[in-house]
């Protein structure tokens, strides 16, 4: 539960996160498990600890081993382990299984390949992508944020895809590569103009001040795996991330494929500790794909605490 496998290539950056739950204010100490020797926090060191993160800049084969992180809260010390393996770079093109991240699959309509572990790094776009060691070129391939999009996927697109990016630490640059397999599903599907199943247009959602509230934006986009379909929430016409209210966050729900084959997406808007001012906002559920955009608007109203009849509409 609290031991995590991590791997990387020599002379590349590797960043590992302690697998224990903690708060940013907690102190985290890192040790070499075998020697119990403390890992320094000074950034001038090639291997150093930075809170929840252990950084190898760059990694060496000799760094392989088990590292202990101790998360120190005011009440407890909790221990986690990072099992790190650093491999020599292969001279040939073949990427061995032990360097592969989880396989992803796509289809003609949906072909996103995410670059594994990239969220741990300080990187800037664009990513470089390779298939079977060849740089991907041509208009069918688009590097977008932390993923690769392949247009008009064919079965020949299956293979091993490597993303390459630069991690920047205090002005120094380090290369990182990560590889995963991509398989292609043969799927006869279609896409439609988005259909929002929830919320209803102009729905009034009853909430209790001081409680948590969830709003779910749910939309279907057609049959089979969809290409470039998204659901999201806006507050007063502004993206959640730009609105700047930490109590209000959106969280991706499950990708759903119903028995009738419809492909649907959910986005849950979580409002912590509902406040009076939240009732003044306009909440827009947006569903968009290649056909266009559909919007349903929700407003919040104060629920009478002694009105039990509608309590089943309210989730934490």
């Amino acid at each position: 539960k609290f031991s995590k496998q991590s791997w990387g290539l020599e002379n590349e950056a590797l960043i590992v996160r302690c697998p224990r739950q903690g708060k940013p204010s907690y102190t985290v100490d890192w040790y070499y498990s075998q020697t119990n020797k403390s890992i320094p926090t000074q950034e001038r060191n090639r291997v150093f600890a930075s809170g929840q993160l252990l950084k190898f800049l760059p990694a060496a084969v000799a760094d392989s081993g088990i590292y202990t992180c101790i998360v120190r809260s005011p009440t407890f010390n909790r221990t986690g382990y990072a099992n790190v393996t650093i491999y020599k770079k292969q001279s040939d093109c073949n990427v061995p299984d032990y360097l592969m991240y989880s396989t992803v699959s796509g289809s003609e309509k949906n072909s996103k390949i995410y670059c594994p572990t990239i969220d741990l790094y300080n990187w800037t776009a664009p990513l470089e992508w390779f298939k079977n060691c060849q740089a991907l070129q041509g208009s069918r391939y688009r590097a977008h944020k932390s993923f690769l999009v392949i247009d008009n996927v064919m079965t020949e697109d299956a293979g091993d895809y490597t993303c390459k990016f630069i991690h920047n630490e205090n002005g120094a640059n380090y290369s990182v590569t990560a590889t995963r397999s991509f398989t292609v599903k043969d799927e006869q599907g279609f896409s439609l103009f988005p259909v929002i199943g929830a919320p209803a247009q102009n729905e009034i959602k009853e909430v209790e001040i001081g409680k948590n509230a969830n709003l779910t934006c749910s939309a279907c986009f057609g049959k089979g795996t969809q290409f470039l379909a998204a659901v999201l929430w806006q507050l007063n016409g502004t993206k959640i991330t730009d609105f700047g209210e930490p109590r209000i966050q959106q969280e991706e729900g499950q990708n759903q494929s119903f028995s009738n084959g419809l492909a649907c997406l959910d986005m849950v808007l979580r409002i912590a500790d509902v406040k009076e001012e939240d009732l003044l906002l306009q909440y827009d559920c947006l569903a968009l794909n290649l056909h266009g955009l559909r919007r349903h608007t929700v407003r919040l109203s104060r629920k009478n605490p002694i009105d039990h009849h509608s309590h089943h509409h309210h989730h934490h």
Partner: antibody, heavy 117, light 106 residues
Amino acid sequence: EVQLQQSVAELVRPGASVKLSCTASAFNIKDDYMHWVKQRPEQGLEWIGRIDPAIGNTEYAPKFQDKATMTADTSSNTAYLQLSSLTSEDTAVYYCALGDFYAMAYWGQGTSVTVSS
Amino acid sequence: ETTVTQSPASLSVATGEKVTIRCITNTDIDDVIHWYQQKPGEPPKLLISEGNTLRPGVPSRFSSSGYGTDFVFTIENTLSEDVADYYCLQSDNMLTFGAGTKLELK
């Protein structure tokens, strides 16, 4: 020495709500998590949930999702538990307890809540 | 949801005897289990934290062992002051207490 001060007892009518308080001394509640635990007469302990007072994030045991609301006021170093739509099933001692994400280290003396008409 | 089955519900021992309490979880939780003692009219007190770690000030006659799904709490040479209810707590997934064990003296 860390101490958690809770009011001793509350007598409330069925259907009403009650808000319990827990004030910490010699400890800044925003530095850790506050848990709430229920204990019915002659029964075992039930975990209600935990709050991260620094940011207000809460997590509830499924059973208490619609019953309990945890809040915290870091300026007064106080955590609160509000219980709504009270019934005789809610008659219990309610403990606040400081700890990390995984367990509780320091406990209050408990507030006895009696629901009776 | 992780559930915890604690046994026995109660037991009666003579002073100096050994006490063994067991908790079984329905999923593998490594060693993320804690043991609490609750004396009458008092709040619970943490005796042993995860990884079988004795809390500061807790006598060494208390110990625990186990990993995965099966956990045991032991009191060697029980004293009269050990009369209390004992609870295990799993914190792998949410938090769940065992039903408790009432320890009495013969």
